[in-house]
């Protein structure tokens, strides 16, 4: 017997062939003996059975000897043995229906699970086997389950169902929601606009909910909220903003905040977060403010850092084209009596310049210019 | 919902080979079969010839010997290659779904041949 | 090949107008036949099959009818958006083939 494997919802094609080349009489039954479909002459002709208005034929193959019946929005329930019969003679044909789904929104949240439920007929014993995007297979019987979905888990899961040493592979689309960076720095001097984007790691037609960002500024003891905001069909909304720093924000995606200046008590660390609509949990993003200072008072002329900095970022002070006068592994870093010239400080990690700001000291006669 | 895409080269010189590709999705492919159709300027619809899932084809007499028709399943792709092309093969090319009718289209190609 | 001769070719009409096109096929194609609208620049769009049977989404202005050689396609009231051309094609053998079109013009 033929074992043919289907997909739910969607046309499957039966075959069955005579050994002449022609049209002739055959019919098509379920194995109840219910007759499905014939023919009679050139006249396709349908029986009682419940797959009357999805069970079709081909006219052009009969006259090849060939008279399929497909069968179209295939159902679980259609697994049965199909008979046709031409020649006076019978071919069975076994066809299972199998289909697989993912039993929550195939948008799911960074770090949620998903689940795929295999739907198969009674006596059936299949296994499946997923790939993901990233190529990690997972295996299993009737649900296969991953856990804390990561932004890489976006895309195509093909799934392969085996049963009857036949295969049939399923392709599931699967979103996963997410900030495109989990976190980010901006490095500014003091004074300059700050900008900071939070762009989105997927795209869909209607996007709507609420965000918040949380700031915790270092010198500062406990975090505050600076702004709130609604989304709506990708347009956005500030619902309420503090006063101090008066942040604004872009109508349109990406998020789009702007801080009209870095300021030393702005340093910090934020947290972003955007509540969808109809979905449980939140997207996160973390974002940094470090904000540089050179100033001159008298005769020391310092270089400061502010915020979240790593332990191994390198503050200098040098003065422009020589070698650098200090360099530190700390937030702040001085220089007595500074000879006259532009100098230069630099925030650096492994020799990459992150941040510089100039400063201009003057002969001591004069008071200094900061560019 | 069923669509078909469809591309591939628009102008052509005389005996050379016409290649077209039809990407099929949002439906079944493989209970199917795909069909390629031709309509030259100001005229009818002439069928050229079909394909299913398993590589079975079918094609039409007049065209048959120099006609290709492939398939590539995994991508739910299906091409047609018409060797040695002359003016007489200048039309719109349609891909098209088919059982007994060709209830979805590819929105064409004009394929224009000429020295 | 299984010939199939539409007539007329063309038919002016006005809006409101019952419009009638038939299609001879030969030899007999038993009811394997279809009805195609095309309007200019576009893919045709299936309208009938089986002779008889509504595609889905199809205004119910548009009937088919006939069995064997003769076939109509029968628009009760035509509306703006039906000017077009028409194409009927048989189902019944290799090579699938098309009637020659008859196109619906404003009077």
């Known amino acids: 017997k033929k074992v043919v494997l289907g997909k739910k919802g969607d046309t499957v094609e039966l075959t069955c062939t005579a050994s002449q080349k022609k049209s002739i009489q055959f019919h098509w039954k379920n194995s109840n003996q219910i007759k499905i479909l014939g023919n009679q002459g050139s006249f396709l002709t349908k029986g009682p059975s419940k797959l009357n208005d999805r069970a079709d034929s081909r006219r052009s193959l009969w006259d090849q000897g060939n008279f399929p019946l497909i069968i179209k929005n295939l159902k679980i329930e259609d697994s049965d043995t199909y008979i046709c019969e031409v020649e006076d003679q019978k071919e069975e044909v076994q066809l299972l229906v199998f289909g697989l789904t993912a039993n929550s929104d195939t948008h799911l949240l960074q770090g949620q699970s998903l689940t795929l439920t295999l739907e198969s007929p009674p006596g059936s014993s299949p296994s499946v086997q997923c790939r993901s995007p990233r190529g990690k297979n997972i295996q299993g019987g009737k649900t296969l389950s991953v856990s804390q979905l990561e932004l890489q888990d976006s895309g195509t899961w093909t799934c392969t169902v085996l049963q009857n040493q036949k295969k049939v592979e399923f392709k599931i689309d699967i979103v996963v929601l997410a900030f495109q960076k989990a976190s980010s720095i901006v490095y500014k001097k003091e004074g300059e606009q700050v900008e900071f984007s939070f762009p989105l790691a997927f795209t869909v037609e209607k996007l709507t909910g609420s965000g918040e960002l949380w700031w915790q500024a270092e010198r500062a003891s406990s975090s505050k909220s600076w702004i709130t905001f609604d989304l709506k069909n990708k347009e956005v909304s500030v619902k309420r903003v503090t006063q101090d720093p008066k942040l604004q924000m872009g109508k349109k995606l990406p998020l789009h905040l702007t801080l009209p200046q870095a300021l030393p008590q702005y340093a910090g660390s934020g947290n972003l977060t955007l509540a969808l609509e109809a979905k449980t949990g939140k997207l996160h993003q973390e974002v940094n403010l470090v904000v540089m200072r050179a100033t001159q008072l008298q005769k020391n002329l310092t270089c400061e850092v502010w915020g979240p900095t790593s332990p191994k970022l390198m503050l200098s002070l040098k003065l422009e084209n020589k070698e650098a006068k200090v360099s530190k592994r700390e937030k702040a870093v001085w220089v007595l009596n500074p000879e006259a010239g532009m100098w230069q400080c630099l925030l650096s990690d492994s020799g990459q310049v992150l941040l510089e700001s100039n400063i201009k000291v003057l002969p001591t006669w004069s008071t200094p210019v900061q560019p | 919902q069923v669509q078909l895409q469809q591309w591939g080269a628009g102008l052509l010189k005389p005996s050379e080979t016409l290649s077209l590709t039809c990407a099929v999705s949002g439906g079944s492919f493989s209970g199917y079969y795909w069909s390629w159709i031709r309509q030259p300027p100001g005229k009818g619809l002439e069928w050229i010839g079909e394909?299913?899932?398993?590589?079975?084809?079918n094609c039409n007499p007049s065209l048959k010997s120099r006609v290709t028709i492939s398939v590539d399943t995994s991508n739910n792709q299906f091409s047609l290659k018409l060797s040695s092309v002359t003016a007489a093969d200048t039309a719109v090319y349609y891909c098209?779904?088919?059982?007994?009718?060709?209830?979805?289209w590819g929105q064409g190609t004009l394929v224009t041949v000429s020295s | 090949d299984i010939q199939m001769t539409q007539s007329p070719s063309s038919v002016s009409a006005s809006v409101g107008d019952r419009v009638t096109i038939t299609c001879r096929a030969s030899p007999d194609i038993a009811n394997w036949l279809a009805w195609y609208q095309q309007k200019p620049g576009k893919a045709p769009e299936l309208l009938i099959y089986?002779?008889?049977s509504l595609q889905s989404g199809v205004p119910s202005r548009f009937s088919g009818s006939g069995s064997g050689t003769d076939f109509t396609l029968t628009i009760s009231s035509l509306q703006p958006e039906d000017f077009a051309t028409y194409f009927c094609?048989?189902?019944?053998?290799?090579?699938?083939?098309f009637g020659g079109g008859t196109k619906v013009e404003s009077k």
């Open positions: 098209a779904r088919v059982l007994n009718y060709f209830d979805y």
């Open positions: 094609q048989q189902a019944n053998s290799f090579p699938l083939t």
């Open positions: 394909i299913n899932h398993s590589g079975s084809t």
């Open positions: 089986a002779a008889s």
